[in-house]
């Protein structure tokens, strides 16, 4: 089977600050130098692209200046980085990996990772 | 809503070319994939091509290399498919396909028709 | 490249009747990766399931998809006068994207 399996983990609790990291590891059936990973969000049966980044094999993943997201590429490895996250912003997103060159051309989508936020609770006012 | 509304085709002699658009629209164009798909009258599908998001990678079944070009301009939401040294096999009816951002084809153009006879 | 075969070629059903459409891969695909598509004459052809047995969107509950591997199903669990079509699978794992050569669903 040439098919391509993208692992990521079930469930990430955003941190306090609304950043949520996590790994998506996929099983490469080509010699790719050329990936795109997506990450997709799915609420009901929409899914809406969050951020996209295309990289060369051994070199930086870099996401447009304005992206949510960062990331760092190891092998087939991609840390992935969702920042500015807020409570409705709770849901379950998807990994997606593109070998986009050269051909075949592959697709690998991950079952999703849960990510909950929780909004922090405002600061007290304090009366000195 | 996504719309995609595809023109050019027409009858030609073998040899001759032809090419096709397809004016998108409803939807963030760049990050999508777009597809030809095509299907000789009375028969199945077949795909033809494809063109990634930026422009720069493409794939082509293997009975169109070197003869099919497919572009993209993301500033007009419009895909083309250059067709060279047309043959009577290439006669058909050519969607044009979004690739949804899960991959299967979600959304289908009404088809234009290409006949190459002489 | 993967060869999909459909099976059979033609089904004659009544309306109300249930509808089993088969679709065989030459090598073990993802079910993350197979897509059914309707076609009626004249007509584009329409996504109905995708991942193998998800419903795309405002597809009826009467259409289900199933299978893993190298076999797969479409199932119309009780077929509607509208539903009288061709059906194709897909699979969309790996270039070229390649198509069965489609099951017809007539009237008996």
């Known amino acids: 089977c040439k098919a391509m399996h993208v692992a990521q983990p079930a469930v990430v609790l955003a941190s306090s600050r609304g950043i949520a990291s996590f790994v998506c590891e996929y099983a490469s059936p080509g010699k790719a130098t050329e990936v795109r990973v997506t990450v997709l969000r799915q609420a009901d049966s929409q899914v809406t692209e969050v951020c996209a980044a295309t990289y060369m094999m051994g070199n930086e993943l870099t996401f447009l200046d304005d992206s949510i997201c960062t990331g760092t590429s190891s092998g087939n490895q991609v840390n992935l980085t969702i920042q500015g996250l807020r409570a409705m912003d709770t849901g379950l997103y998807i990994c997606k990996v593109e070998l986009m060159y050269p051909p075949p051309y592959y697709l690998g989508i991950g079952n999703g990772t849960q990510i909950y936020v929780i909004d922090p609770e405002p600061c007290p006012d304090s009366d000195f | 809503q996504v719309q995609l509304v595809e023109s050019g085709g027409g009858e030609v002699q073998p040899g001759r070319s032809l090419r096709l658009s397809c004016a998108a629209s409803?939807?963030?164009?760049?990050?999508?994939?777009m597809h030809w798909v095509r299907q000789a009258p009375g028969k199945g599908l077949e795909w033809v091509a494809v063109?990634?998001?930026?422009?720069?990678?493409?794939h082509y079944v293997d009975s169109v290399k070197g003869r099919f070009t497919i572009s993209r301009d993301n500033s007009k939401n419009t895909v083309y498919l250059q067709m060279n040294s047309l043959r009577a096999e290439d006669s058909a009816v050519y969607y044009c396909?979004?690739?949804?951002?899960?991959?299967?084809?979600?959304?289908w153009g009404q088809g234009t028709l290409v006949t190459v006879s002489s | 490249e993967i060869v999909l075969t459909q099976s059979p070629g033609t089904l004659s059903l009544s309306p109300g009747e249930r509808a089993t459409l088969s679709c065989r891969a030459s090598?073990?695909?993802?079910?993350?990766?197979l897509a059914w598509y309707q076609q009626k004459p004249g007509q584009a052809p329409r996504l109905l399931i995708y991942?193998?047995?998800s419903r795309a969107t405002g597809i009826p509950d009467r259409f289900s998809g199933s299978g893993s591997g190298t076999d797969f199903t479409l199932t119309i669990s009780r077929l509607e006068p509208e539903d009288f079509a061709v059906y194709y699978c897909q699979q969309y794992g790996s270039s070229p994207w390649t198509f069965g050569q489609g099951t017809k669903v007539e009237i008996k």
């Open positions: 090598q073990s695909v993802s079910s993350s990766y």
């Open positions: 409803g939807f963030t164009f760049s990050s999508y994939g």
């Open positions: 396909v979004r690739g949804g951002q899960l991959g299967a084809f979600d959304y």
């Open positions: 063109i990634w998001y930026d422009g720069r990678n493409k």
């Open positions: 991942g193998a047995s």
